[in-house]
């Protein structure tokens, strides 16, 4: 679809005569008839196949024709066509004299013709005007012409319809050849597909408007390149969605079981050495001078009561020193210079001579001990605490500090390892002498029944088109991660590309 435009510029008829040579009375009131038709080697009368147009009276005898296009007038003359411009044409321009106001062909005498010109040739679509001048014996006509496309038509023949748009069926303007030129941020044959945020993962991300990156299920992050780990995964990571690969020192289905209590919590004090001994279990090996489960208690060397025979102990930086009572000597006041005559036995102890009176021995009443019955009985000397418990004197009584796994006054009771319900997924717990054992239900295995074995939603290969299947362990369902070009919960649908333009 386009328009053949003809701009009449000047008509010269100096003598004011008709084609017959007869003069016009009072002058030649001139109007034009234009016939546009298909190319003819010799232009002949017949239908104006491309269109016709007539002007009103434009002047008398000789005159210049005003350009009237801006005011909506009739110059240039418009000859619209609704077909592909063929590139060739024939043009007939007739100048007529109008004796009266009726310009219809049937109202004019046949000899009212002033002049007739006929041209033919090639003409390409374009904005440039072709200037021409045709002269006869009595007249001269200067004019220019061109062919332009109608609005929204493009191409060499004005055959391509293109309407710029910016809605969800396309975001584009039209190029001179009628092809689409996508607006920034859009792509695709019809410019309806947004260009996602730069770096947005091709398979795991998509967008509904430019510079956006929306993540498919199982993926997260600005570029949708980070997998979402299994729901509840505590100290673990993933390389594909719904995984939970435990960080070092952690175990269990959700990586929430601490296998390295020593590193994560540093429970041992005062430079003690920590050893992991199971889940949330550890043992501290104390440096000399320290005691307690966590080596938190400073151990005085006098606590072991090394001084005998009533000697008093004094702590020193490099050990201890015994101050012996009269009649005793030695590192621990273990040597006596006394005999029974010196009444050396305290607290009602009875003295017995030895070695012909050179030495003695005290027989102590209950609750007292020592070579001179000078000490109350240390209730811990008999090691009353079982299972490695530590005995602590507390005045007239004593108490046992038990190792993990034991309880009772003397640490004689084995704490049930099953009390913490360590068996996952409904496993049955059995106490053993040195730990516990889990009997797992169908579908689970491992020391704590934490490993899912038989139920695998991906086992049936539900995903199509080489998609990757992930089992969601919390729901026994699967998630398909589609390769580029496929969508759907099983990646069963190809993302169709629109076919080419229909023309």
């Amino acid at each position: 679809s386009g328009v053949f435009q003809l701009q009449l510029q000047e008509f010269i008829n100096e003598r004011g005569v008709l084609a017959s040579g007869r003069p016009c009375e009072p002058g030649c009131r001139t109007f034009f008839r234009v016939c546009l038709k298909h190319f003819q080697a010799v232009v002949s009368p017949g239908p104006c196949t491309f269109g016709t147009v007539s002007t009103p009276v434009l002047g008398t005898n000789s005159f210049a024709v005003r350009d009237d296009s801006s005011g909506g007038g009739r110059n240039p003359l418009q000859l619209p066509f609704n077909f592909t411009w063929p590139g060739t044409f024939s043009l007939i321009i007739e100048a007529w004299h109008a004796p009266g106001d009726d310009l219809r062909p049937e109202a004019l005498p046949p000899d009212a013709l002033i002049s007739k010109i006929a041209i033919q040739g090639s003409l390409a679509v374009g904005q440039n005007w072709l200037l021409d001048e045709q002269t006869s014996t009595l007249t001269r006509l200067r004019y220019s012409y061109r062919v332009i496309c109608s609005d929204n038509y493009y191409g060499d023949n004005c055959s391509r319809l293109c309407k710029k748009r910016n809605d969800h069926f396309g975001h584009y303007v039209c190029q001179p050849d009628g092809n689409l030129s996508c607006l920034p941020g859009w792509t695709g044959e019809y410019c309806q597909q947004p260009i996602c945020l730069s770096g947005c993962h091709e398979q795991n991300g998509y967008c509904s408007k430019p510079a956006e990156c929306l993540c498919r299920p199982g993926w997260q992050g600005r570029l949708c390149n980070e997998c979402i780990p299994h729901n509840g995964c505590r100290h673990g990571t993933c390389s594909t969605p719904w995984q939970c690969t435990c960080d070092e020192g952690w175990g269990g289905l959700f990586c929430d079981q601490d296998l390295n209590y020593c590193t994560h919590h540093s429970p041992c004090k005062n430079g003690a050495t920590c050893s992991n001994s199971g889940q949330r279990s550890y043992t501290c090996t104390c440096r000399p001078g320290y005691t307690g489960v966590d080596c938190e208690l400073e151990l005085s060397e006098c606590d072991s009561n090394p001084c005998r025979n009533g000697g008093s102990c004094k702590d020193q930086e490099d050990g201890y020193h015994c101050l012996c009572p009269p009649g005793y000597y030695g590192l621990h006041c273990e040597h006596s210079t006394l005999s029974c005559a010196d009444s050396p036995c305290f607290n009602g102890g009875s003295c017995r001579e030895r070695n012909q009176g050179a030495n003695y021995a005290c027989e102590c009443p209950p609750n007292f001990t020592g070579s001179n019955c000078e000490k109350k009985v240390d209730r811990c000397t008999s090691n009353p605490c079982a299972n490695g418990g530590q005995c602590l004197n507390r005045g007239p009584s004593r108490m046992c500090r038990c190792r993990p796994g034991f309880t009772g006054t003397y640490c004689e009771l084995h704490v049930s390892d099953c009390a913490r319900n360590p068996c996952a997924h409904g496993g049955t717990c059995h106490d053993l002498e040195n730990g516990l054992m889990c009997t797992c239900p169908a579908g689970f295995s491992g020391r704590r029944c934490e490993v899912r074995t038989s139920i695998d939603a991906c086992a049936s290969s539900p995903c199509f088109n080489r998609a990757t299947c992930y089992t969601d362990l919390s729901t026994d369902t699967f998630v398909c991660n589609c390769p580029y070009g496929f969508v759907g919960s099983r990646c069963e649908f190809p993302v169709g590309l629109p076919p080419s333009f229909p023309w």
Epitope: F169, G188, L214, V487, P494, P498, P499
Partner: antibody, heavy 121, light 106 residues
Amino acid sequence: EVQLQESGPGLVKPSETLSLTCTVSGGSISSSSYYWGWIRQPPGKGLEWIGDIYYTGSTYYNPSLKSRVTISVDTSKNQFSLKLSSVTAADTAVYYCAREDVILRGGSDYWGQGTLVTVSS
Amino acid sequence: SYELTQPPSVSVSPGQTASITCSGERLGDKYVSWYQQKPGQSPVLVIYEDFKRPSGIPERFSGSNSGDTATLTISGTQPMDEADYYCQAWDRDTGVFGYGTKVTVL
């Protein structure tokens, strides 16, 4: 041959939410060449475009209904749905679902047979 | 909001030409589709992209669009062409239908 089929209740009480589903067969709802639209026609009146959706979930609504309309898509079921809240008697109409073709510059080449929804107490 | 105006009714004798107009501001800059709807039936696309016919639509249906007016022409109208006809265009992201024209074949 692509076919569209509307389904949902034929009677809805005023102030409640109208819910309809369109099931697409014979073609994938996930094609990049199509939008999936809802159009309605009150008895004896003309067609009114309600809104449409792309398989990615992008939605476009008629401004006059936007505050009450929600259109969603379920690619796994090859379905898309319409919800219209706070309905009144003026929402009584035959509701059509249709396929809008990008290549046809938005022309709707396939339509459902329509379902009459009456709003009445 | 954008409006498309159609004459409520057009009457035509069998074999004659029926022309239905659809007017809207700068409508020639938009792509126009035309739908035929017979009583109790769903609409059928008869013209898209101003003048193109989907497969299966008879050649007697033609379309044009320029300026502010699009026209659907039914040449050699047949009794089976009696129906309501709707024009449709897109204004930004909104679909807009004309009010509809009832074509009666006398």
